[in-house]
């Protein structure tokens, strides 16, 4: 089932929920962080439950088997359906935006290809939530700093139209 | 009843091309990862390539890479591998196979196999 | 790549005798992605056991996996008839997924 935080109004669908791999990590994340870096994976999007937990899996099993990573490299996965999958949570340094930044943020995916269009407004809104989450479980600083993928790293992600989306979020600033 | 039925494999000359079917039944096959695994003439079984449920992601050994393609058609329940550049050593009996996150990925249906011979 | 060496590579037993086989890998695997597959003469390779110690649908109890890291091994109760045929381990921990070389065993 869904688990919902009281302070929050995005739920989190639990690793086992989506019928995820083990995880092999070990690195923890000193917690509270100060930033967020939110990219795509850009492979293919999901609009159910169904689809979207199987494109969680997916994308885990990219990185674990061909990648070696020793989970899905993202802390929390977006999809279209309005739900937020967990990855490797707050607690566990990503794989996400290369060795310098990951144990400084959380990296949160946006599952799908968004160089030509945005992520549905229910995905929006799940990532919006899940950050307040996060401020409100004192995982995030409440002056975190929201960074999309490619202002850390040479990247295309998150995708020109989501880039173009999350510059006018509140907590993002520009490189 | 799960069924996977290979075709398409024969005699090939060096440099030639050659396609792979497997026809799946008796499962959701788009629920499954599809691979395809090969038999030397000398018994070792060696991974050629795997397809995810959904085709986002295709995976190959470096001896293969680029050469050879793995596709798949949920509509229609058939798993392909397209083969080109062909080499004397991909010369093996050709297994499809399915596996999912249901018993970690292990292959627990295979087909009866088809057969490709490289040689000039 | 993770290589997998199987020993020995050809053994026979006799009736009712125990007999093990063994799979090192050169690198560590979880023991959750090390599988087993037997193979006849003429026919394709059946899952046996998964990860490590799963019997597959229709297996007999007789046979049993253990292991972990890097040191893997199959087990026979007690051999029949049955059983000769060769078994393969195989690793899904990493890509490229590689295949042991097998043991072949044979009645004595």
């Known amino acids: 089932q869904e688990t919902e935080d009281p302070a929050c109004c995005s739920p989190i669908v639990p690793r086992n929920e989506w019928k995820a791999l083990a995880s092999e990590c070990a690195q923890h994340l000193s917690l509270p962080l100060r930033y967020v870096v939110v990219s795509h994976t850009a492979g293919s999007s999901c609009n159910t439950p169904a689809s979207c937990q199987q494109q969680a899996r997916n994308v885990q099993h990219y990185h674990m088997k061909t990648l070696g990573w020793c989970d899905v490299g993202y802390n929390f996965l977006i999809g279209e359906d309005g739900l937020v999958y967990e990855g490797r949570g707050w607690n566990f340094t990503g794989a996400h935006s290369g060795h310098l930044w990951n144990p400084m943020s959380i990296g949160i995916s946006f599952m799908g290809n968004y160089m030509d269009r945005v992520p549905t407004p229910q995905a929006i809104r799940a990532a919006q939530g899940l950050l307040a989450c996060g401020v409100a479980q004192g995982a995030l600083r409440s002056n975190y700093v929201l960074k999309g993928h490619r202002d850390v790293q040479r990247t295309l992600s998150p995708g020109n139209q989501l880039y173009h989306l999350i510059q006018n979020w509140p907590h993002y600033r520009s490189p | 009843e799960v069924q996977l039925v290979e075709s398409g494999g024969g005699l090939v000359k060096p440099g030639g091309s050659l396609k792979l079917s497997c026809a799946a039944s008796?499962?959701?096959?788009?629920?499954?990862?599809m691979y395809w695994v090969r038999q030397t003439p000398e018994k070792r079984l060696e991974w050629v390539a795997a397809?995810?449920?959904?085709?986002?992601?295709?995976y190959y050994p470096d001896s293969v890479k680029g050469r050879f393609t793995i596709s798949r058609d949920n509509a229609k329940n058939n798993l392909y591998l397209q083969m080109s550049s062909l080499k004397s050593e991909d010369t093996a009996m050709y297994y499809c196979?399915?596996?999912?996150?249901?018993?970690?990925?292990?292959?627990?249906?295979w087909g009866q196999g088809t057969s490709v011979t490289v040689s000039s | 790549q993770i290589v997998l060496t199987q020993s020995p590579a050809i053994m026979s037993a006799s009736l009712g005798e125990r007999v093990t086989m063994t799979c090192t890998a050169s690198?560590?695997?979880?023991?959750?992605?090390l599988h087993w597959y037997q193979q006849k003469p003429g026919s394709s390779p059946k899952l046996w056991i998964y990860?490590?110690?799963n019997l597959a649908s229709g297996v007999p109890a007789r046979f049993s996996g253990s292991g972990s890291g890097t040191s893997y091994s199959l087990t026979i109760s007690s051999m029949e008839a049955e059983d000769a045929a060769t078994y393969y381990c195989?690793?899904?921990?990493?890509?490229?997924?590689?295949f042991g070389s097998g043991t072949k065993l044979e009645i004595k």
């Open positions: 195989h690793q899904y921990h990493r890509s490229p997924f590689t």
């Open positions: 196979a399915r596996g999912g996150y249901g018993n970690l990925y292990a292959m627990d249906y």
């Open positions: 990860s490590t110690s």
């Open positions: 397809i995810s449920d959904d085709s986002t992601y295709t």
């Open positions: 008796g499962f959701s096959f788009s629920d499954y990862y």
């Open positions: 690198s560590s695997v979880s023991s959750s992605y």
